[in-house]
């Protein structure tokens, strides 16, 4: 019968010929009367056999990631008679793994959006690297993730690649962050190979800023001939938030004379001071009103940022018109 052990050949061997093992018949008494032959894919080109001894050699550098096993056939013939000594047999040569592939992030580019002011521990995104080496062969494909750039705002779970928030961020200070993640095989041990990826993390806006008047005092004039409904001027607040979080409503906080009103231009986010009652220079030519401004939409959980509305004072001077 045939005698052999399981055949393994390490990939990426640089020698011109590498002894893999021996294939022989137990009828072979070593007097060189038998001839061994190798057949199948790779026979003669990748693997050769010593016809006399049955020793098998790899004569080419192998790449496990290209092909991890070879199925060959062996024959043994009696040189004197030309007859087969043993029935033809199929055997396997397995290419054993070495750590010759670095981890690769295949889903690049990574981009994530997370609300500003999100609490610590909030999940941002999961990044996943793959390693072409053999996962069943030691630690060649066992990966550990680490953060190369992004502290102190982000952290990565070493075994899962899950990126989480580790410190609250304010969009109004910085609205996006580049995080660099490294994946290392060999669970970080010596000889490890690594790959990196960049993750663009954008902060979405939350309504954590109230509108604030640009000026603490506005000066307006109105002619005593102005009809009710006349727009006599505009006031403006600014809000560091964006979109609907910056939409605001202006209103009168104090006007003892009840002579003016303020409406909001929702396109420009300006407050328009409107004459509600006609004025008379001879009766009163100084009016003072206090206006306030608030955001249009404020979720309950963000009310803490909006406790006291910003106010401004508007001094209004009535201009005299010569009466006939």
């Amino acid at each position: 019968g045939w005698v052999w052990n399981q055949f393994f050949v390490p990939e990426e061997m640089n020698t011109t010929s590498h002894h893999i093992g021996q294939l022989r018949s137990d009828l072979d008494n070593g007097n060189n009367s038998f001839q061994y032959k190798l057949l199948g894919a790779g026979a003669g080109s990748t693997f050769i056999i010593d016809e006399r001894t049955g020793d098998i050699y790899a004569i080419q550098k192998l790449d496990r990631e290209e092909r991890s096993l070879y199925i060959l056939r062996a024959q043994v013939i009696d040189i004197a008679t030309g007859r087969a000594v043993e029935p033809e047999s199929e055997f396997v040569i397995k290419v054993s793994d070495i750590n010759d592939n670095e981890p690769k992030f295949l889903d690049e580019p990574y981009e994530a959006i997370v609300p500003e002011m999100s609490p610590e521990g909030t999940l941002v995104i999961q990044v996943t690297a793959s390693d072409a080496d053999d996962p069943s062969s030691g630690n060649n494909a066992r990966l550990l993730y680490s953060l190369l750039q992004g502290q102190p705002y982000f952290s990565v779970e070493p075994t899962t690649g899950v990126i989480r928030i580790s410190s609250k961020m304010d969009r109004e200070l910085q609205d996006e962050y580049w995080v660099i993640i490294q994946a290392k095989d060999m669970i970080g041990q010596p000889g490890a190979l690594s790959g990196t990826t960049s993750v663009l993390i954008k902060l979405s806006d939350v309504n954590d800023n109230k509108p604030i008047f640009k000026e603490s005092l506005y000066r307006l004039t109105v002619s005593e001939s102005a009809p009710t409904g006349t727009s006599i001027g505009t006031i403006m607040a600014y809000d560091n938030d964006i979109g609907e979080n910056a939409e605001m409503d202006y209103s009168i906080e104090e006007d003892d004379s009840q002579t003016f009103d303020i409406i909001t231009n929702h396109e420009t986010q300006e407050g328009i001071v409107i004459l509600k009652k006609k004025v008379d220079f001879e009766h009163q030519n100084h009016y003072g009103i206090r206006a306030k401004v608030k955001n249009h939409h404020v979720p309950e959980q963000l009310m803490k940022y909006h406790t006291e509305a910003s106010t401004t004072f508007i001094k209004i001077q009535v201009e005299d018109v010569d009466e006939p």
């Epitope: 003892d256 009766h283 030519n285 100084h286 003072g288």
Partner: antibody
């Protein structure tokens, strides 16, 4: 602290001219409307003129309209009152006063400068 | 223009007494835009009360203002020696006008 110091007063003949000045310090002069108020000897206070913080608007009492001109120089923190064609009834102590920013009353006054119109 | 009439012209009182000064406007003073000033001989006026009843920071609480519309009052609850002076009311609702003043003198 807020300080207003008037100068330029003295004796002036009727029909001649005189320029009063008020040097302001201790506050942002360019943010405040400024006034001149006068007080004839032994009499009460009379408002004379006002100029807005930026010089854009000026208003005068009827008694001085067309004769007096109020002006300001925000670069030197100085208020002026140009008195043309003064009359005997313009004889008074002239005070400069600061208008409170968020209302119309006068929160600070200078010590005054006496103008005597006499031939 | 709004004419302010102060009464009495002179008030003769002793230290410790209560002083009540009146200021009447010829037409309603909008939004209680009325101030009171104190003036001592040779000095500039000093603001005491604004908005008819608001006391300026640093002014003793014996000074109080009240009133609205056309009738306003300055009250000095207990006269101190330094309170003897001339007091002016001023309206700033319609331009600026002053009353003719009330002199508070030592009796």
């Amino acid at each position: 602290q807020v300080q207003l110091v008037e100068s330029g007063g003295g004796v002036v003949q009727p029909g001649r001219s005189l320029r009063l000045s008020c040097a302001a310090s201790g506050f942002t002069f360019s943010s405040y409307d400024m006034h001149w108020v006068r007080q004839a000897p032994g009499k009460g206070l009379e408002w004379v003129a006002v100029i807005w913080y930026d010089g854009s608007n000026k208003y005068y009492a009827d008694s001085v309209k067309g004769r007096f001109t109020i002006s300001r120089d925000n670069s030197t923190n100085t208020l002026h009152l140009q008195m043309n064609s003064p009359r005997a009834e313009d004889t008074a102590v002239y005070y400069c006063a600061r208008e409170y920013r968020y209302s119309w009353y006068f929160d600070y006054w200078g010590q005054g400068t006496l103008v005597t119109v006499s031939s | 223009e709004i004419v302010l009439t102060q009464s009495p012209g002179t008030l003769s009182l002793s230290p410790g007494e209560r002083a009540t000064l009146s200021c009447r406007a010829s037409q309603s003073v909008g939004s209680s835009y009325l101030a009171w000033y104190q003036q001592k001989p040779g000095q500039a006026p000093r603001l005491l009360i604004y908005g008819a009843s608001s006391r300026v920071t640093g002014i003793p609480d014996r000074f109080s203002g009240s009133g609205s519309g056309t009738d306003f009052t300055l009250t000095i609850s207990r006269l101190e020696p330094e309170d003897f002076a001339v007091y002016y009311c001023q309206q700033y609702s319609n331009s600026w006008t002053f009353g003719q003043g009330t002199k508070v003198e030592i009796k």
